[in-house]
Amino acid sequence: HSDGIFTDSYSRYRKQMAVKKYLAAVLGKRYKQRVKNK
C-alpha cells in the first residue's frame, strides 16, 4: 500500500514521506508531553 497522496514523481514521494515523518515526530512529542503532564 501507499498512504501518501498518489504522485508520479519520486522526489515528491520522498518529500511526502519526509513531511509525514516530521508530523509523526511532532505529534509523538506532543503525546509524550501530555502523558508526562497528567
Epitope: H1, S2, D3, G4, T7, D8, S9, Y10, S11, R12, Y13, R14, K15, M17, K20, K21, A24
Partner: antibody, heavy 117, light 112 residues
C-alpha cells in the same frame, strides 16, 4: 559504509512464490528507501518497487502490482520481496538497492531465482 | 512510462581512446525540485551494478575523473575520456524522476 546482504539462490516451480531477503548494515535502515530491481539472464534492469520502512509505505511498478509484496522488519534491518504466481519469465537475478540522493548508491549482491518445472 | 533509449548497443574502443554513450528519455527528466535525476551505472560480468554518476554529472566517490556525465532535459551523455582495460563493462542510464523508475537497455563497452 552501507552493506546489503541478500539470501541465497532459489529454484521454484511455476505457480509458486519466492521470498528474497536483504539485510542492511552500516546505515539508517528505517529512514532509507529500499528498492528491488531484477535482471533476467543476459538482459537489462527492471524496477519492481520500493518500501520506506518507517511507515511500511510501498510503491510498485504497475507490471508487478498484485503479484509482488515488499515488506520490512525494522528490528532486524531486513527487507523482503515476495513474488507470487511465478512463471519461467521470472527467472532472473533479484537485487535490493538503497537510495541516497535519488539514486541507488548501494546494491545487494543479487539473488538468482530460477523458475523451472 | 518513460522510455530510456541508449545508443549504441555496443562499442569497441582502443585503449586510451574516448568512449561516448548516449541516453535519450521520452520525457524531460527535470523535476519540480529543479534537479534532474539521471544516473549512470556500471556493471561488470557476474557483479551487481555500481553507481557511477548521479544527478547527471556528479561522480560517485572513488570513480576516476575520466568518467563524466553531461546533458539536460531529455538528452544525456556518458563519456570515458581515455578508456582503460578495467572499464570493460555494460553501462546503463536510468531515471529516478518519475514512477516507475526506468532503465536504458545498456551499452556494452569493449576494447578494440
Amino acid at each position: 559504509e552501507v552493506q546489503l546482504v541478500q539470501s541465497g539462490a532459489e529454484v521454484k516451480k511455476p505457480g509458486s512464490s519466492v521470498k528474497v531477503s536483504c539485510k542492511a548494515s552500516g546505515g539508517t535502515f528505517s529512514d532509507s528507501y529500499m528498492h528491488w530491481v531484477r535482471q533476467a539472464p543476459g538482459q537489462g534492469l527492471e524496477w519492481m518497487g520500493l518500501i520506506y520502512p518507517i511507515f511500511a509505505d510501498t510503491r510498485y511498478a504497475q507490471k508487478f502490482q498484485g503479484r509482488v509484496t515488499i515488506t520490512a522488519d525494522e528490528s532486524t534491518s531486513t527487507a523482503y520481496m515476495e513474488l507470487s504466481s511465478l512463471r519461467s519469465e521470472d527467472t532472473a537475478v533479484y537485487y535490493c538497492a538503497i537510495d541516497y540522493d535519488g539514486s541507488f548508491a548501494y546494491w545487494g549482491q543479487g539473488t538468482l531465482v530460477t523458475v523451472s518445472s | 512510462d518513460i522510455v530510456m533509449t541508449q545508443s549504441p548497443d555496443s562499442l569497441a574502443v582502443s585503449l586510451g581512446e574516448r568512449a561516448t554513450i548516449n541516453c535519450k528519455s521520452s520525457q524531460s527528466l527535470l523535476d519540480s525540485d529543479g534537479k534532474t535525476y539521471l544516473n549512470w551505472l556500471q556493471q561488470k560480468p557476474g557483479q551487481p551494478p555500481k553507481r557511477l554518476i548521479y544527478l547527471v554529472s556528479t561522480r560517485e566517490s572513488g570513480v576516476p575523473d575520466r568518467f563524466s556525465g553531461s546533458g539536460s532535459g531529455t538528452d544525456f551523455t556518458l563519456t570515458i575520456s581515455s578508456l582503460q582495460a578495467e572499464d570493460v563493462a555494460v553501462y546503463y542510464c536510468w531515471q529516478g524522476t518519475h514512477f516507475p523508475l526506468t532503465f536504458g537497455g545498456g551499452t556494452k563497452v569493449e576494447i578494440k
